[in-house]
Interface confidence: low
């Protein structure tokens, strides 16, 4: 699986999850998030050669098409597969509010 | 929606579905598919600016991150959203077989 366990331990050029730390205030301008200050959102990148973690029949077909037609601009793209939530604390006036934001942390990638 | 109705009628630079005809024999080397000879598989391409058909909270965050940090390599990618099946005819010996292949035709795209 193209997950953090594999990708963070290997120098993988092809589609894999990459570490990306995002500081809410500095990187997003989100001053309203009280905690955490930031988090590892991670992201997916790298080429999708034929059959590499293909998501659908279409991505398999497109991967083969791209292999046989390397000048073509159509190819699968490395995108998130499994995501995890992140619990944040923010304030409405002086009242603390806790909310779980879904799909915030990329744990694995796929070729789609 | 970034679907064929919209994308095929507009000169859209950002993420959209693009027409792509694939000939089974010439483009894939699949000599076993008797009919159709080929089909419009289509594909997704184009930049994913902030908030453009964002698939998850993560893609929204990544889009904003990329807007505020344009030198960053991390950005959402334009990938298939809705796919349709394709019915094909092939032969096993002299016996014709009809099969529906799932997720073969891209109808719309999203930023993931």
């Amino acid at each position: 699986a193209l997950d953090t366990n594999y990708c963070f331990r290997n120098l993988e050029e092809n589609c894999c999850v990459r570490p990306l730390y995002i500081d809410f205030r500095q990187d997003l301008g989100w001053k309203w998030v009280h905690e955490p200050k930031g988090y590892y959102a991670n992201f997916c990148s790298g080429p999708c050669p034929y059959l590499r973690s293909a998501d659908t029949t279409h991505s398999t077909v497109l991967g083969l098409y791209n292999t046989l037609n390397p000048e073509a601009s159509a190819s699968p793209c490395c995108v998130p597969q499994d995501l995890e939530p992140l619990t944040i604390l923010y304030y409405v006036g002086r009242t603390p509010k806790v909310e779980q934001l879904s799909n915030m942390v990329v744990k694995s990638c796929k070729c789609s | 929606a970034l679907d064929t109705n919209y994308c095929f009628r507009n000169l859209e630079e950002n993420c959209c579905v693009r027409p792509l005809y694939i000939d089974f024999r010439q483009d894939l080397g699949w000599k076993w598919v008797h009919e159709p000879k080929g089909y419009y598989a289509n594909f997704c391409s184009g930049p994913c600016p902030y908030l453009r058909s964002a698939d998850t909270t993560h893609s929204t965050v990544l889009g904003l991150y990329n807007t505020l940090n344009p030198e960053a390599s991390a950005s959402p990618c334009c990938v298939p959203q809705d796919l349709e099946p394709l019915t094909i005819l092939y032969y096993v010996g002299r016996t014709p077989k009809v099969e529906q292949l799932s997720n073969m035709v891209v109808k719309s795209c999203k930023c993931s």
Epitope: P36, Y40, V98 | -
Partner: antibody, heavy 120, light 107 residues
Framework: QVLLQQSGPELVKPGASVKISCKAS????????IHWVKQRPGKGLEWIGR????????NYTGKFKGKATLTADKSSSTAYMQLSSLTSEDSAVYFC?????????????WGQGTSVTVSS | SFVMTQTPKFLLVSAGDRVTITCKAS??????VAWYQQKPGQSPKLLIY???NRYTGVPDRFTGNGYGTDFTFTISTVQAEDLAVYFC?????????FGGGTKLEIK
């Protein structure tokens, strides 16, 4: 690899203060909270507070406000906790721990603990 | 602040047994609960985060479940090296309170 190295045991007199340290290595010190936890002999874990080394932001649990002061030095990647007006109730092992950096979800690395004994 | 009530306080089991520890939060913490193992003379070690996510390198005999206020931690087949105290902790809102702990002893 990630390591949190705490200072050695302390024997201090009642009424005095003590400052214990937690030196971090193997990760971006500024980007993750450092928590402090108290454990009295044979007892459970008690959360004291935490500090975000990036900007010095702190939070304390009520009973440790005024008792514990958390600071951090980014240049040496070291977090400190000062305990003041010590009494026998402050005799305990104190742990520093890093908030899990990949999901900010829990404390994934802990120091070895610093034993503080308050005795005259 | 949140109170985490952990039960039981003690567990005496044999190797091979299945054990379950429960933790009840005084109010909803969504799924922001972690479980730690502390062996005698050692620092606590993270086993489970976000209620059910096994931390890297943790054997799959350790599992966590729950949402809202009720959480469970299970060791499917206890081994001799599991002798330790186990703590739950809510990681939902400061102050991040711990449960009182469960001491697991092997017969």
């Amino acid at each position: 690899q990630v390591l949190l190295q705490q200072s050695g045991p302390e024997l201090v007199k009642p009424g005095a203060s003590v400052k214990i340290s937690c030196k971090a290595s193997g990760y971006a010190f500024s980007s993750s909270w450092i928590h402090w936890v108290k454990q009295r002999p044979g007892k459970g874990l008690e959360w004291i507070g935490r500090i975000y080394p990036g900007d010095g932001d702190t939070n304390y649990t009520g009973k440790f406000k005024g008792k514990a002061t958390l600071t951090a030095d980014k240049s040496s990647s070291t977090a400190y906790m000062q305990l003041s007006s010590l009494t026998s109730e402050d005799s305990a092992v104190y742990f520093c721990a890093r908030r899990m950096i990949t999901t900010q979800a829990a404390m994934d690395y802990w120091g070895q603990g610093t034993s503080v004994t308050v005795s005259s | 602040s949140f109170v985490m009530t952990q039960t039981p306080k003690f567990l005496l089991v044999s190797a091979g047994d299945r054990v379950t520890i429960t933790c009840k939060a005084s109010q909803s913490v969504i799924n922001a609960v972690a479980w730690y193992q502390q062996k005698p003379g050692q620092s606590p070690k993270l086993l489970i985060y976000y209620a059910s996510n096994r931390y890297t390198g943790v054997p799959d005999r350790f599992t966590g479940n729950g949402y809202g206020t009720d959480f469970t931690f299970t060791i499917s087949t206890v081994q001799a090296e599991d002798l330790a105290v186990y703590f739950c902790q809510q990681d939902y809102s400061s102050p991040y309170t711990f449960g009182g702990g469960t001491k697991l002893e092997i017969k």
